[in-house]
Interface confidence: low
């Protein structure tokens, strides 16, 4: 680590004084920063000389020596003080630019130390601090603005009290630039637009930054529009903005408008688009099937998207039939607005029941007309069976009767015993009927479908059972014959299973 | 120039997943809804999903609903479809399509091949 | 979903000739919301008709479109070279949205 001579580490001297520092190392050295030409440098291997014979107050600062070639890179230092009665302070910078919340340094040094207790920083011709100033003064740096605010870019001085009078340093400027974070924070209003030809619109690109230094424009499609700018300044921010205002807008105007504004950090860019029709629209969409099938006792829900321009008058929910004159509930009945333009609604329909079957419409109404979009609800139920003995042209018949939705199939089982139900070991024979006869078919019911099965006797200890099935559920009827007989035949065309 | 160009296409086993991107350029991608749209090996146009301006909605097809996810990343100007569980018929070439709301899809890029087998 | 049937499938024709495309919708198409897309082969589909029967710009004006409810047609006045395509009609609202299977236009 270098020496410096005289030891210090300060020396006060008066004007007009001869100063001479000396620095000694085990290697060459050299003298830190600027020398001011009132100084006479002298270098002989390891020492380095600095010499003046008439010392003035800019003398006063803080001397610095390096030993460039030492690995631990130690310095030494002095501060000379030249305490000039007429001239307290030693400005060595006129103009000091930091960032916001960062420390700024005011380089006012002082060139007596005996003056240091009546010291005080001000503003330009003497004004007071603005409050909040957080300060503090070293007589080797100066003063110190701790985590300096935008609004303290002013012009300071830096008083002494000398005897009974103060003594101004020269001002120094202090410019704090804001932080700029990122590009300019952007509103484009409205975020989507529809107007009819010949109508009025006004589209807002407004544009807000840290400071003043930013740009916006409006931009239609590709075209840069020349549009007069508001500025305004409030919560902190700087404020720009656009206003296109059309009287009676044209297709021409119709297509993609953005707001882009930029500063230093950036561009920052938002889009809407804009609409020309030639009338009022309406339209009603689903992204479900119209056509719906519910198992009895489920729930549903009915869903409508709606475009519209101009604005709904009025839309509702009405059920068609065919089954009762019930209306949905208006608490079942659910809108939200997607935006502008945009609507959906939707109709709730829990634990469905067989009267709910049938038609559901939303209407809705606005300037260009009536719309509706009509939803047909089929309920599906699991078959429900029943069996009944019957001679037809002279023959007994078993006849099952099976009703569901969707159609159930029909199986018949013979099986060995008496029983409730056939289960598969007990199963003799097993004929498919391919072709129920249907009974009714009506919209919304239920199907009913008919399986006969002709025998000239039945045996009496085995169960003959009907079995009926569908993608919901199944459903059977056992016969229990009570006669005693030889042999049953099915149809035909019914399939033989042994 | 306004122009969509699509990669990440390529071959995959069957059940493998793959992401394919769109690189939009030459207008202001925030402001378009984008579509994904293949075609089989000589077959017709069929329509996969869509992913509005600022990606709040997203659609799909039936047949890839559950296995593929299209997003976007606005300040990239980029679209993507990630394709999991992927199948032999999902092979197509892939295009990325732009939705200018006006009607149809204005701008195309040149497509993808994604080809799905063992 | 809206189903599309394109017909013919296919057709023959030479320069000059008047060609006429049709694609009939399963229910009708909300709004005339169709388009139709020229696509040769190699390449991406090319919008040559929105909304039924507005030209793209930059399109030739002897592409034309017309129709409503569930018919559409697209008609090329005097076919040129060029022309020799696919050419395919979409319906573009609601979602989900549909192509046509397709007509390929080839010479004669």
């Known amino acids: 680590i270098p020496v410096i001579e005289p030891s210090g580490p300060e020396l006060v001297v008066k004007p007009g004084e001869m100063v001479t520092l000396r620095c000694v190392g085990n290697g060459s050295v050299e003298w830190d920063g600027p020398i001011s030409p009132h100084w006479t440098l002298y270098s002989d291997g390891p020492s380095s000389v600095l010499t003046t014979t008439n010392a003035t107050f800019q003398n006063t600062r803080t001397y610095r020596c390096t030993e460039p070639g030492d690995p631990l890179g130690g310095s030494a230092a002095i501060h000379l003080y030249v305490k000039d009665p007429a001239r307290p302070w030693n400005v060595l910078a006129k103009e000091v630019v930091v960032f916001e919340d960062q420390d700024a340094l005011l380089p006012c040094l002082l060139t007596d130390p005996v003056l240091e207790a009546g010291v005080s920083l001000v503003r330009l011709r003497g004004r007071p601090l603005l409050r909040h100033t957080n300060y503090s003064f070293s007589p080797w740096h100066g003063f110190t603005i701790h985590r300096a605010k935008f609004i303290q870019g002013q012009d300071y001085q830096c008083s002494a009290l000398m005897g009974s009078r103060k003594v101004m340093s020269i001002s120094i400027r202090l410019k704090v630039q804001k932080v700029i974070p990122g590009p300019p924070a952007l509103t484009l209003v409205p975020e989507e637009l529809v107007r009819i030809r010949g109508e009025a619109a006004q589209i807002v690109c407004s544009a807000s930054n840290i400071d003043v230094d930013f740009d916006v424009f409006l931009q239609h499609n590709t075209t840069k529009l020349a549009i007069p700018q508001r500025s305004d300044f409030h919560d902190n921010r700087y404020q720009k903005v656009l206003t296109l205002s059309l009287g009676q807008v044209d297709f021409q105007h119709a297509g993609n408008y953005s707001c882009v504004a930029s500063n230093v950090q950036g561009k920052h860019s938002t889009s809407m688009f804009f609409r020309v029709v030639e009338s009022a629209y309406l339209d009603l969409s689903s992204e479900q099937n119209l056509i719906q099938e519910v198992t009895v006792g489920e729930g549903l829900n009915l869903k409508v998207m709606v475009e519209a321009y101009p604005g709904l008058q009025g839309f509702n929910w009405t059920y068609l039939g065919p089954f009762s004159d019930h209306q949905p509930e208006p608490k079942l009945a659910n809108a939200t607005t997607k935006d502008t333009y945009r609507h959906t609604f939707t109709l709730s329909l829990p634990r469905l029941k067989p009267s709910e079957a049938g038609c559901y419409s939303f209407l809705a109404r606005n300037p260009g007309g009536w719309r509706a979009l009509t939803f047909e609800l089929t309920l599906r139920y699991p078959p429900e069976v029943s069996v009944i003995w019957t001679s037809i042209n002279g023959s007994g018949t078993l006849l099952c009767a099976a009703s569901g939705y969707p159609q159930p199939n029909v199986t018949w089982l013979q099986c060995a015993g008496h029983t409730d139900r056939c289960d598969e070991a007990q199963v003799l024979q097993v004929w498919v009927d391919p072709h129920p006869e249907v009974l009714s078919q009506e919209p919304f019911q239920k199907v009913t479908v008919q399986s006969l099965l002709t025998a000239e006797t039945l045996e009496h200890n085995q169960t003959y059972e009907c079995r009926a099935h569908n993608s919901v559920g199944s459903g059977s009827w056992a016969f229990i014959p009570i006669s005693a007989g030889a042999r049953t035949h099915p149809p035909d065309e019914f399939l033989f299973t042994p | 120039e306004v122009q969509l160009v699509e990669s990440g296409g390529g071959l995959v086993q069957p059940g493998g997943s793959l992401r394919l991107s769109c690189a939009a350029s030459?207008?202001?991608?925030?402001?378009?809804?984008i579509h994904w749209v293949r075609q089989a090996p000589g077959k017709g146009l069929e329509w996969v999903s869509v992913?509005?301006?600022?990606?709040?909605?997203?659609y799909y097809a039936d047949s890839v609903k559950g296995r593929f996810t299209i997003s976007r990343d606005n300040s990239k100007n980029t679209l993507y479809l990630q394709l999991n569980s992927l199948r032999a018929e999902d092979t197509a070439v892939y295009y990325c399509?732009?939705?200018?709301?006006?009607?149809?899809?204005?701008?195309w890029g040149q497509g993808t091949l994604v080809t799905v087998s063992s | 979903d809206i189903q599309l049937t394109q017909s013919p499938s296919s057709l023959s024709a030479s320069v000059g000739d008047r060609v006429t495309i049709t694609c009939r919708a399963s229910?009708?198409?909300?709004?005339?919301?169709l388009a139709w897309y020229q696509q040769k082969p190699g390449k991406a589909p090319k919008l040559l008709i929105y909304?039924?029967?507005s030209l793209e710009s930059g399109v030739p004006s002897r592409f034309s479109g017309s129709g409503s409810g569930t018919d559409f047609t697209l008609t090329i006045s005097s076919l040129q070279p060029e022309d020799f395509a696919t050419y395919y009609c979409q319906q573009y609202y609601p979602i989900p949205r549909t192509f046509g299977q397709g007509t390929k236009v080839e010479i004669k």
């Open positions: 909304d039924a029967s």
């Open positions: 399509a732009r939705d200018p709301g006006v009607g149809g899809f204005d701008v």
């Open positions: 992913i509005s301006g600022y990606g709040s909605s997203t």
């Open positions: 030459g207008f202001t991608f925030s402001g378009y809804a």
């Open positions: 229910q009708s198409v909300r709004r005339r919301f």
